[in-house]
């Protein structure tokens, strides 16, 4: 049985040129994190392997750091950059969690982070 | 240039013990990941697992009750053990590396494989 | 594990000819996909990462696309060095899975 729950930093908003970090934090279960895959879409944005590190995808190198933590920091931001983020943590023995971001990217200078938010969606993967 | 050399014995009995080691030169096995792959006769590549540059390992838990990977750091080699073997294990072997950083999980350096058969 | 289909199994091009190799995963990899070709008697060899970039030296007729479930080797001018079994490969999350081969051969 699925225990855990992820919290994300929810819906947040950023300008345009400047950067936001992605986090999501996994909790209320003790399966060991083998993975975190990064994603926008059908785009891998980057993968933090509990073993190897990162790998950041080559689309994404340039505006993309890894970090801090299992986080993932976007710069350069632009208003395409709008849109969904995830966070998948690949568990064992639970099996796959989910975390959803919404960040807008705004032209103007008004920009604030949403508050931080639990997801009780989670999705088990075989 | 990373080169890979495996060896081992080519004919191993039913329920003994596969042994292989990889031997590493024009790279330092402390950096990146180094793997086990094969290839049964006739079928899909296989990955069996990996040593990572801290000497953590993984292995395909198809197998995980069966595998050990272990390094040895001084002389920069690396080694596969497989215990109670069958025919089925019957495949050629390759050592290889991974810059997961760069590629992912995709292998850019291979060694040149050894067949090994599982047979009385 | 994510098992990977490809198709067809085997293949045979004229030379100067388009080759094209699919593969399908058994679930959505993004773009975590990986294509190796092996010659007769030779290690595979790394030809295409992250669904489409060319690994160093690979000649650019040889190229990779598709993200999500569906993807494609593309041979866009097939010379005779080319003749080889292809594989893909998943390294979306372990254990990484590869695909069970396309044989490309000469018409």
């Known amino acids: 049985m699925m225990t855990g729950t992820i919290e994300t930093t929810g819906n947040i908003s950023a300008e345009k040129g400047g950067s936001i970090i992605l986090q999501c934090h996994l909790s209320s279960t003790t399966a060991q994190v083998t993975q975190v895959n990064w994603e926008q879409q059908d785009q891998l944005l980057a993968i933090c392997n509990a073993d190897l590190g990162w790998h950041i995808s080559p689309s994404f190198k340039d505006r993309v750091a890894p970090g801090p933590g299992l986080g993932l920091t976007l710069q350069s931001l632009t208003v395409n950059d709008t849109g969904e983020y995830f966070c998948i943590y690949h568990t064992y023995p639970d099996g796959t969690y989910t975390g959803r971001i919404f960040l807008e990217v705004l032209e103007s200078s008004v920009a604030e982070h949403g508050a931080r938010f639990q997801i009780p969606h989670h999705h088990h993967h075989h | 240039e990373v080169q890979l050399q495996e060896s081992g014995p080519g004919l191993v009995k039913p329920s003994e013990t596969l042994s292989l080691t990889c031997a590493v030169s024009?790279?330092?096995?402390?950096?990146?990941?180094w793997n086990w792959i094969r290839q049964p006769p006739g079928k899909k590549l296989e990955w069996i697992g990996y040593i990572s540059y801290s000497g953590n390992t993984y292995y395909n838990p198809s197998l995980k009750s069966r595998v050990t990977i272990s390094r040895d750091t001084s002389k920069n080699q690396f080694s596969l053990k497989l215990s109670s073997v069958t025919a089925a294990d019957t495949a050629v072997y390759y050592c290889?590396?991974?810059?997961?950083?760069?590629?992912?999980?995709?292998?850019?350096?291979w060694g040149q494989g050894t067949t090994v058969t599982v047979s009385s | 594990d994510i098992v990977m289909t490809q198709s067809p199994d085997s293949l045979a091009v004229s030379l100067g000819e388009r080759a094209t190799i699919n593969c399908k995963a058994s679930q959505n990899v993004r773009t975590a996909v990986a294509w190796y070709q092996q010659k007769p008697g030779q290690s595979p060899k790394l030809m295409i990462y992250?669904?489409?970039y060319r690994y160093t030296g690979v000649p650019d007729r040889f190229s990779g696309s598709g993200s999500g479930t569906d993807f494609t080797l593309t041979i866009s001018s097939l010379q005779a060095e080319d003749v080889a079994v292809y594989y893909c490969q998943q390294y979306y999350t372990t254990p990484w899975t590869f695909g069970g081969g396309t044989k490309v051969e000469i018409k």
């Open positions: 024009g790279y330092s096995i402390t950096s990146d990941s």
């Open positions: 290889a590396r991974l810059d997961f950083s760069n590629y992912g999980g995709a292998v850019d350096y």
């Open positions: 992250s669904a489409s």
